[in-house]
């Protein structure tokens, strides 16, 4: 805590300007009026205050707004934002997308690198959380903004949080935004994507839905296999194993089209490995790829899960 001392004669700040960078901490405390600082917050960003000087400025704002800063101040915090703790930010009510963008831009400046950071800093995560909760749902404009700054943002949300994403927002999602999503997250996102893209024709639909297919059930994969989609192996390898297992050899062949030859290179990896174990060797042989491990001729396949359900 900075001691309260009288401001020396002639040093009282009439505006937030560059002369203040030559003030000692105690002079800033004594000579800068908090209300003046709040109204001229946008100037701070262009003046290279030291870390210690910014402590004093933050302290002044904290005293002026003990219940949390108003949005008019928050929007102009500039690099002072990076001194805020998650506890500070939880007191804020941020409703403007412009404010969110301004602060994400500041943080991006701090973390500039060839790739945008995959996961936000704690104070940024708190800011986003406050913003989304204030809006009630992750609408398209917000999602557009967040994924532009953090391509991995969607995949940092829990399945429960993802359930608040309306299908209309799915249009803002790019394939790279889903790179780090796990199956549980895709299980939530896939039905929303299916709904969002339902009015598109076959080939266009597949282009849009492709990156969400890690959440697709068997019946949807069967339907896609009838549409000459030529799914690539990378997409196939991300499908749910339980959704792939019931597919027949003919269905997989139709689903992959010319990419079916890639199965050979993946025969030891899931879901291909588990799928091979469920197919008749005769059927696998029709692919002419030399896939081994299928069920030999003459063997009876018992579906034990069905048997358990009946007993």
């Amino acid at each position: 805590e900075v001691e309260k001392t009288a401001c020396p004669s002639g040093k009282k700040a009439r505006e937030i300007d560059e002369s203040l960078i030559f003030y000692k901490k105690w002079e800033l405390e004594a000579c800068v009026d908090a209300a003046l600082l709040a109204t001229q917050m946008d100037r701070v960003n262009a003046i290279p205050f030291t870390y210690e000087q910014l402590d004093v400025l933050k302290h002044k704002l904290d005293e002026l707004y003990p219940q949390g800063y108003p949005e008019s101040v928050i929007q102009h915090l500039g690099y002072l934002f990076l001194k805020m703790s998650p506890e500070d930010i939880r007191k804020w009510n941020v409703t403007s997308l412009e404010t969110l963008k301004a602060l994400l831009e500041v943080n991006k400046g701090h973390e500039m690198s060839p790739q945008a950071p995959r996961r936000p800093l704690p104070q940024v995560a708190t800011l986003i959380d406050r913003f989304v909760k204030g809006r009630g749902q992750l609408d398209k404009d917000t999602l557009d903004t967040l994924t532009a700054f953090y391509p991995g943002y969607l995949c940092s949300l829990s399945p429960e949080e993802l359930s608040s994403v309306p299908p209309s927002s799915i249009w803002a999602v790019r394939p790279q935004d889903l790179d780090t999503c796990d199956p549980r997250q895709l299980d939530v996102l896939y039905p929303k994507a299916r709904l969002a893209f339902q009015n598109m024709n076959g080939s266009e639909y597949f282009v849009k839905i492709q990156s969400f297919l890690g959440g697709a059930p068997t019946e949807d994969l069967k339907a896609l296999s009838q549409q000459n989609v030529s799914m690539d192996l990378a997409t196939f390898m991300k499908l749910r194993t339980d959704a792939v297992l019931p597919l027949t050899v003919a269905e997989v062949q139709k689903l992959l089209g010319p990419h079916v030859e890639g199965l050979k290179a993946e025969e030891r990896h899931r879901p291909v490995r588990d799928w091979i174990l469920r197919q008749r060797q005769d059927d696998l042989d029709t692919l002419g790829l030399g896939l081994q491990g299928g069920i030999p001729n003459g063997y009876l396949v018992l579906d034990l899960s069905m048997q358990e359900a009946l007993s």
């Epitope: 100037r43 290279p48 400046g109 500039m112």
Partner: nanobody, 120 residues
Framework: EVQLVESGGGVVQPGRSLRLSCAAS????????MHWVRQAPGKGLEWIGS???????YYNPSLKSRVSVSRDNAKNTLYLQMDSLRAEDTAMYYC??????????????WGQGTLVTVSS
């Protein structure tokens, strides 16, 4: 990747003027305040001035009467105009972006600098 490239330095006679440029790339230049900083031989860094994204400028009071900072956001370029040059203005001039993390504040991105020598 962030890049700041200064140009325009050289040998100048006392009393003359000079305009330095700084070409920026790899970030949203128009969103950030940018700064000019200099370092004379054997001395520490001296902040010259800065310009906000909207064009508002701030200057070191000791240099205010002789320097002018401007920017062209369309060209991603920052400028420094220096008038009435003196021998003590001899220095390496850098354009930089200032920023803070949760533990410190500093000029976090710099150019390689351009040398200005004031000599007759």
């Amino acid at each position: 990747e962030v890049q700041l490239v200064e140009s325009g330095g050289g040998v100048v006679q006392p009393g003359r003027s000079l305009r330095l440029s700084c070409a920026a790339s790899g970030f949203t230049f128009s969103s950030y305040a940018m700064h000019w900083v200099r370092q004379a031989p054997g001395k520490g860094l001296e902040w010259i001035g800065s310009i906000r994204h909207d064009g508002n400028t701030y200057y070191n009071p000791s240099l205010k009467s002789r320097v002018s900072v401007s920017r062209d956001n369309a060209k991603n370029t920052l400028y420094l105009q220096m008038d009435s040059l003196r021998a003590e203005d001899t220095a390496m001039y850098y354009c930089a972006k200032y920023g803070c993390s949760s533990i410190s504040c500093s000029f976090d991105y710099w150019g390689q600098g351009t040398l200005v020598t004031v000599s007759s």
